[in-house]
């Protein structure tokens, strides 16, 4: 026997209390597949999050981060403060890269300069806090 709920399209839920009729998801909720017995509450992009895509009856909202922050985690579950190039984020805020390390992005950690001699090469261009060394022949 076919489950009557399987006839309920995305954007609705199958209402067990009303003879399995398909009821529309209320505002700010969605069901992305058919045959669902519930609707999911839409994600709200608040505070440091901003809305990248509005919620619809069939798909969740998508958030990104306000300027000065960047996304972390699946689906931008967290926003982390940007730093300048040549810095990394620590518990005490943005700190300059230590000598011998660099960061060419606004996120992530400072990484050691490339050791050219390991490849039998010499330094063509010195490294900075923002840039790796350039190795040459």
């Amino acid at each position: 026997l076919q489950d009557p709920c399987s006839n309920c399209p995305a954007g609705t839920f199958c209402d067990n209390n009303r003879n399995q009729i398909c009821s529309p998801c209320p505002p700010n909720s969605f069901s992305s597949a058919g045959g669902q017995r519930t609707c999911d509450i839409c994600r709200q992009c608040k505070g440091v999050f901003r809305t990248r895509k509005e919620c619809s009856s069939t798909s969740n909202a998508e958030c990104d981060c306000t300027p000065g922050f960047h996304c972390l985690g699946a689906g931008c579950s967290m926003c982390e403060q940007d730093c300048k190039q040549g810095q990394e984020l620590t518990k005490k805020g943005c700190k300059d890269c230590c000598f011998g390390t660099f960061n060419d992005q606004k996120r992530g950690i400072c990484r050691p300069w490339t050791n050219c001699s390991l490849d039998g090469k010499s330094v063509l261009v010195n490294g900075t806090k923002e840039r790796d060394v350039v190795c040459g022949p």
Partner: nanobody, 120 residues
């Protein structure tokens, strides 16, 4: 940590009304559907209803005697129960979930409950 606290229970006579309250601390109801369940002695937990975004969904037993509403400013959800019957005697629990309705859902958080007794 989210805490849900129910209040407003008590002993009333058949035909009377009661309004139960559910207050949230540690988090607002903003992003959650709020549901009510009840459990009578020796019986299984029963779904009462769910409120979300201006819409309410109810279980199949109460015949329009129960109404769920919400006061955003007070971060409180209410269960208005009219024309109470002895079979409404139970512990009433407030719960929250990211699903609507909560008829078939295990809530994310649930309160300790408030006792309602309907007796002549």
């Amino acid at each position: 940590q989210v805490q849900l606290v129910e209040s407003g229970g008590g002993t009333v006579q058949p035909g009377d009304s009661l309004r139960l309250s559910c207050a949230a601390s540690g988090r607002t109801f903003d992003n959650y559907a709020v549901g009510w369940f009840r459990q009578a002695p020796g019986k299984e937990r029963q779904y009462v209803g769910t409120y979300w975004s201006g819409y309410a969904h109810y279980g199949d037993f109460e015949n329009n005697r129960f109404t769920i509403s919400r006061d955003n400013a007070k971060n409180t959800v209410y269960l208005q129960m009219d024309n109470l019957k002895p079979e409404d005697t139970a512990v009433y629990y407030c719960a929250i979930s990211l699903k609507y309705p909560m008829a078939t859902v295990t809530p994310d958080y649930q309160g300790q409950g408030t006792q309602v007794t309907v007796s002549s």
